[in-house]
Interface confidence: low
């Protein structure tokens, strides 16, 4: 279930998912889980998950091979989730393989994680 953005598509605000024990602390930014590598087949669907939390709520950018990911209606999209952000690619093609990186910032700190789609 995607949100297909048309403006500033590389920016996805996220929820402060793990804030329950952090509410009275100063700002923080945490990578909750390293991104998973994906091995899949042509024509299938792949999902990459960027699991981050922070205060203030972080902004997430997606990159493929160091270039911002551009969404394609009904095929390649990403959106905010309750744990960060999810990138979904449908109907995989050989050109979709590569290094995918999510970069999260809360205005003070930056965290990132990289996964490989092959």
């Amino acid at each position: 279930q995607e949100t297909e953005l048309s403006v500033s598509a590389e920016l996805v605000p996220t929820s402060s998912w793990n804030i329950s024990s952090e509410l009275n602390k100063d700002s923080y930014l945490t990578l909750d889980e390293p991104m998973n590598n994906i091995t899949t087949s042509l024509g299938q669907t792949a999902e990459l998950h960027c699991k981050v939390s922070g205060n203030p709520p972080p902004t997430i950018r997606w990159f493929k091979n160091d270039a911002p990911v551009v969404q394609e209606p009904r095929r390649l999209s990403f959106r905010s989730t309750i744990y960060g952000s999810r990138l979904r690619i449908r109907n995989l093609d050989t050109t979709d393989t590569g290094y995918f990186q999510c970069v999260a910032t809360n205005g003070k700190e930056v965290v990132s994680s990289t996964g490989v789609l092959f």
Partner: antibody, heavy 114, light 107 residues
Framework: QVQLVQSGAEVKKPGSSVKVSCKAS????????MHWVRQAPGQGLEWMGW????????KFNHKFDGRVTITADKSTSTAYMELSSLRSEDTAVYYC???????WGQGTLVTVSS | DIQMTQSPSSLSASVGDRVTITCQAS??????LIWFQQKPGKAPKSLIY???SLANGVPSRFSGSGSGTDFTLTISSLQPEDFATYYC?????????FGPGTKVDIK
């Protein structure tokens, strides 16, 4: 095609425990959260907690005061929710739901009655 | 805990009517809100994510607006299959909390 199939209805005595299962297919359990939500008859929805089966992390609604345990068996792609010290007000339909609440199980009715 | 209130608690409407349901949070939740539809005996179905984003496969007559503490679900032209109960859910802070629901029935 994502499917969450839950175990069947249960009737329990006050003070006992119930364990409800949720088997996932078409869905990678280890890299997604699984939520549990309940709904008393004629009432609204209440979030109970989640598990992240990839590392076993869990988060609970403090309202349940330690009565809820959520586990997962990665080998069978099944999540479990156990509620202990049952009381009559725990009579409800219990649902499992995927990370973003986009897929739900069919629900399991748990009746607590003496 | 963040308290979620919905209004009205129930409403009667006719096919073709424009229906508006509001959800209010007791504190700022940004855009971290989901709207659900539930029919009797069925599991809830997500309609709107992140306050304004339509879920996959949901008809465009449904729309969401708002941020912070005040949110609205609008059905632009009510259809027979839309008679149901609607819930909002905040996922800004633990515990996640649902609104009490708004039942939409036939006038």
């Amino acid at each position: 095609q994502v499917q969450l199939v839950q175990s069947g209805a249960e009737v329990k005595k006050p003070g006992s425990s119930v364990k409800v299962s949720c088997k996932a297919s078409g869905y990678t359990l280890t890299t997604n959260y699984m939520h549990w939500v309940r709904q008393a008859p004629g009432q609204g929805l209440e979030w109970m907690g989640w598990i992240y089966p990839g590392n076993g992390n869990t988060k609970f609604n403090h309202k349940f005061d330690g009565r809820v345990t959520i586990t997962a068996d990665k080998s069978t792609s099944t999540a479990y929710m156990e509620l202990s010290s049952l009381r009559s007000e725990d009579t409800a339909v219990y649902y499992c739901a995927t990370s973003d609440f986009d897929y739900w199980g069919q629900g399991t009715l748990v009746t607590v009655s003496s | 805990d963040i308290q979620m209130t919905q209004s009205p608690s129930s409403l009667s409407a006719s096919v073709g009517d424009r229906v508006t349901i509001t959800c209010q949070a007791s504190q700022d939740i940004g855009n971290n809100l989901i709207w659900f539809q539930q029919k009797p005996g069925k599991a809830p179905k997500s309609l709107i994510y992140f306050a304004t984003s339509l879920a996959n496969g949901v008809p465009s007559r449904f729309s969401g607006s708002g941020s912070g503490t005040d949110f609205t679900l609008t059905i632009s032209s009510l259809q027979p299959e839309d008679f149901a109960t609607y819930y909002c859910l905040q996922y800004r802070e633990y515990p996640l909390t649902f609104g009490p629901g708004t039942k939409v029935d036939i006038k």
